[in-house]
């Protein structure tokens, strides 16, 4: 039986009965918030073999092992993850071991096992046999291994039953509990699963199978399941569904999303039955189950019941997320806010058409209107008194409307009005008249030449760069010394720079009047020698990264024809030099024969240039005679050969803080103080833990349904 679409068992342990007939949970399984310690021994679900999304366990009192509950759970597919994880075991106060002895494969995602004070048998599981990459696993804050004394079956009797693998240079037995080994398939099976008797399964099987080389005997499928068979792809006239099975058109045509209160059915796209058309596609008509590409952003019409939508906060802007056509009027009144420009762009940046008018008033937090980055048409079907369809009044910090070199905006009907915008140059308004096609519609008083731009540098001279030099993490630039009519009016220069992967940034990107600014700023004093050109060394930059840079002269407010004179440069794009890449990630090696090693790795996180090739070096290691002098059946850990590397194991320091030998020097010493990098890493780690815990709480604590 397929159960789903995600099972949430909370508060009452008897809800576990819902799992009674499940063989596959199509979705997630949550078992959480059961605060009364219960006896779970009577609950056993041997039929459950697959969870298609993730398994989350959180604060279940009295549960000591998962092995009795789910003795045959073989695969967690991770089709959807919980914060990047397919298995989360968090704050399970009584859990002593995981015990999922039949768990063979976590197809996607990592594991997070954290804050389980009594949990052992963690170091005895080789997760690399279950997951593709173990580097993202997070196993922290459980019972210390030294207090666990984990023993695999048969070890004490000196008749070990489990197989050994190496983890972190430690060659040891692998088991889930004191009486359950971790199953490993013969090397002859390669990546294939195997039966209990170590016979290789069919290549389409995942996890395990009941008979060898038979695609109808799989416990789970590597790719897709259809009519009792594991198949590499869905057959004709069937469609992939929920990442693991094939369904027919009729099935797909009759299902609805349970997450929505509308009855917009599923669609078929690219061989998959899915809830929505993917990004960039739209349904091909109201009765259609198929998707067609959108021309440009996909249209989404939004309507305001009261006709006029007031945007006075990020929250009110949020309602317009994804809207491309707004039926009604926009009244923008943003007096304050944090990171307001980028937040508004996030929520309003797709709007292309406003059917009514746009009014911007008392928006002292705005420096630019570029957050409406796709607005191309104001229809003016409804206008303000006086026939205005674009109205800009009393915005103390507004300096730019849009970047008119890259903007095509039409105002179909109605006039424009501008007053009391002291930093908005009249030339900017006149430019808008030309672009929008409203020139000639405005009467004399509609654009006030005295109180618009009265406090701005409206007559700007251009500063020219004279030289640029780059290294891997530095840029040196110089520019012509600006000479205003009265040299005493020049105070200094400000250099603005930021990462710019594309050559499409403007001065006002991400900038608002409340201190948020996507540009880094550096002040540059005037060189004392009048003949020396001003310049700056920008350091601490990333290698092989394109930066945008511009310079502004800081001048006294020298009034000339009622306006201030200033100077600034064009935006210059400049790339730092390439550098050595960071190390390749997740290096794994395995032997597939007596004369071959297969080595796999992921690209470096910081390529610092265009990667052209990798260098793989290897060398033969002498067999370590030390390994033969140890009794492998003893409970002790296998001693690992230590190399003097000038650092000390922190755990050893706590035991005997005064007698450790530091590096090559004799004599007692204490743990070395943490470096800045280590402190930073610890801080980030703590932050990451908090973020996850918040995510967990926000996801699982939900209002009681009505």
């Amino acid at each position: 039986e397929i159960c789903g679409p995600g099972i949430d068992i909370r508060n009452d342990y008897q809800q576990l009965k819902r799992l009674e007939n499940c063989t596959v949970i199509e979705g997630y399984l949550h078992i959480l918030l059961i605060s009364k310690a219960e006896d779970y021994r009577s609950y056993r679900f041997p039929k459950l073999t697959v969870i298609t999304e993730y398994l989350l366990l959180f604060r279940v009192a009295g549960l000591e092992s998962l092995g009795d509950l789910f003795p045959n759970l073989t695969v967690i597919r991770g089709w959807k993850l919980f914060y990047n994880y397919a298995l989360v075991i968090f704050e399970m106060t009584n859990l002593k071991d995981i015990g999922l002895y039949n768990l063979r494969n976590i197809t996607r995602g990592a594991i997070r096992i954290e804050k389980n004070a009594d949990l052992c048998y963690l170091s005895t599981v080789d997760w690399s046999l279950i997951l593709d990459a173990v580097s993202n696993n997070y196993i922290v804050g459980n019972k210390p291994p030294k207090e666990c004394g984990d023993l695999c079956p048969g070890t004490m009797e000196e008749k070990p039953m489990c197989e050994k693998t190496t983890i972190n240079n430690e060659y040891n037995y692998r088991c889930w509990t004191t009486n359950r080994c971790q199953k490993m398939c013969p090397s002859t099976c390669g990546k294939r699963a195997c039966t209990e008797n170590n016979e290789c399964c069919h290549p389409e099987c995942l996890g395990s199978c009941s008979a060898p080389d038979n695609d109808t005997a799989c416990v789970a499928c590597r790719h897709y399941y259809y009519a009792g068979v594991c198949v590499p792809a869905c057959p004709p006239n069937t469609y992939r569904f929920e990442g693991w099975r094939c369904v027919d058109r009729d099935f797909c045509a009759n299902i609805l999303s349970a997450e929505s209160s509308d009855s917009e059915g599923f669609v078929i796209h690219d061989g998959e039955c899915m809830q929505e058309c993917p990004s960039g596609f739209i349904r091909n008509g109201s009765q259609s189950m198929y998707c067609i590409p959108c021309e440009g952003p996909c249209p989404k019409v939004c309507e305001e019941e009261k006709k006029t939508k007031t945007i006075d906060s990020v929250t009110s802007a949020q309602m317009l997320q994804g809207c491309t056509i707004f039926k009604g009027n926009l009244l923008i009144n943003i007096r304050r806010g944090n990171n307001i420009a980028s937040e508004l762009e996030n929520f309003m940046g797709l709007i292309e058409v406003v059917t009514g008018y746009v009014k911007i008033r008392h928006s002292h937090a705005l420096v630019s209107l570029s957050f409406l980055k796709n607005l191309r048409l104001i229809l003016g079907e409804e206008q303000l008194e006086g026939n205005y369809s674009f109205y800009v009044l009393d915005n103390q910090n507004l300096q730019q409307l849009w970047d008119w070199d890259h903007r095509n905006l039409t105002i179909k009907a109605g006039k424009m009005y501008f007053a009391f915008n002291p930093k908005l140059c009249v030339s900017e308004i006149y430019r808008m008249e030309e672009v929008t096609g409203t020139k000639g519609r405005q009467s004399k008083g509609d654009i006030n030449t005295r109180n618009n731009g009265e406090r701005a540098s409206c007559e700007s001279d251009v500063l020219h760069f004279t030289s640029t030099t780059t290294s891997k993490n530095r840029i040196i630039i110089t520019w012509h010394r600006y000479r205003p009519p009265d040299y005493r009016d020049l105070i200094s220069f400000t250099v603005y720079y930021k990462e710019a992967p594309f050559k499409n940034v403007t001065e006002y990107d991400g900038q608002d009047a409340c201190g948020s600014n996507s540009w880094n700023m550096v002040d540059v004093d005037l060189p004392p020698n009048k003949d020396v050109e001003p310049g700056i060394l920008l350091h601490g930059l990333k290698p092989w990264t394109q930066y945008a840079v511009y310079v502004k002269a800081v001048t006294l407010t020298m009034v000339e024809n009622d306006h201030i004179r200033g100077a600034k440069s064009e935006i210059l794009y400049i790339r730092t030099n390439a550098s050595v890449p960071s190390i390749p990630l997740d290096v794994l090696s395995a032997s597939n024969s007596s004369s071959q090693l297969i080595v796999k790795w992921n690209p470096p996180s910081l390529p610092n240039g265009n990667l052209s090739y990798y260098i793989v070096r290897w060398q033969r290691q002498p067999q370590d005679g030390y390994l033969y002098r140890h009794n492998y059946c003893s409970k002790d850990k296998i001693p690992i050969r230590k190399y003097a590397d000038g650092t000390i194991d922190i755990e050893e320091v706590t035991e005997n803080p005064k007698t450790e030998v530091c590096g090559g020097e004799k004599g007692p010493c204490c743990a070395c103080p943490k470096t800045e990098a280590e402190k930073q890493a610890e801080k980030e780690e703590a932050e990451y833990r908090k973020v996850f815990e918040n995510f967990l709480h926000n996801s699982i604590f939900v209002p009681r349904p009505e």
Partner: nanobody, 128 residues
Framework: QVQLVESGGGLVQAGGSLRLSCTAS????????MAWFRQAPGKEREGVSA????????YYADSVKGRFTISRDNAKNTLYLQMDALKPEDTAMYYC?????????????????????WGQGTQVTVSS
């Protein structure tokens, strides 16, 4: 408080027509999917037809395809079911239902669990 009131039921001869209406109040009608269900004496409640809010996409049970038509008027907050070529087996109590969010995943349009609000029903009797 959400309220759904069905009307338009009655006694009709086989082959005849009826038009059921369901007027909703207490909700933003234009954002909810809606459906008609029916329950004959001694039988399970079954889905007859459903309609989405945004696009007007429609769904029909095989037994009524080609005979029944579902529609809605968002301005009037009303859902309709036009029933033609009625058969005696269409005799049942007809209920109007409104979708609700119901956790994760999916369900079939004719599953009652996907609907959060229900009307009192209107009786349709088809005589032979």
């Amino acid at each position: 408080q959400v309220q759904l009131v069905e009307s338009g039921g009655g006694l009709v001869q086989a082959g005849g027509s009826l038009r059921l209406s369901c007027t909703a109040s207490g909700l933003t009608f234009g954002t909810f999917g809606m459906a008609w269900f029916r329950q004959a004496p001694g039988k399970e409640r079954e889905g007859v037809s459903a309609i989405s809010a945004s696009s007007g996409r429609t769904y029909y049970a095989d037994s009524v395809k080609g005979r029944f038509t579902i529609s809605r008027d968002n301005a009037k907050n009303t859902l309709y079911l036009q029933m033609d070529a009625l058969k005696p087996e269409d005799t049942a109590m007809y209920y109007c239902a409104v979708r609700s969010k119901n956790g994760a995943g999916y369900g079939f349009w004719y599953e009652a669990r996907l609907y959060g609000y229900w009307g009192q029903g209107t009786q349709v009797t088809v005589s032979s």
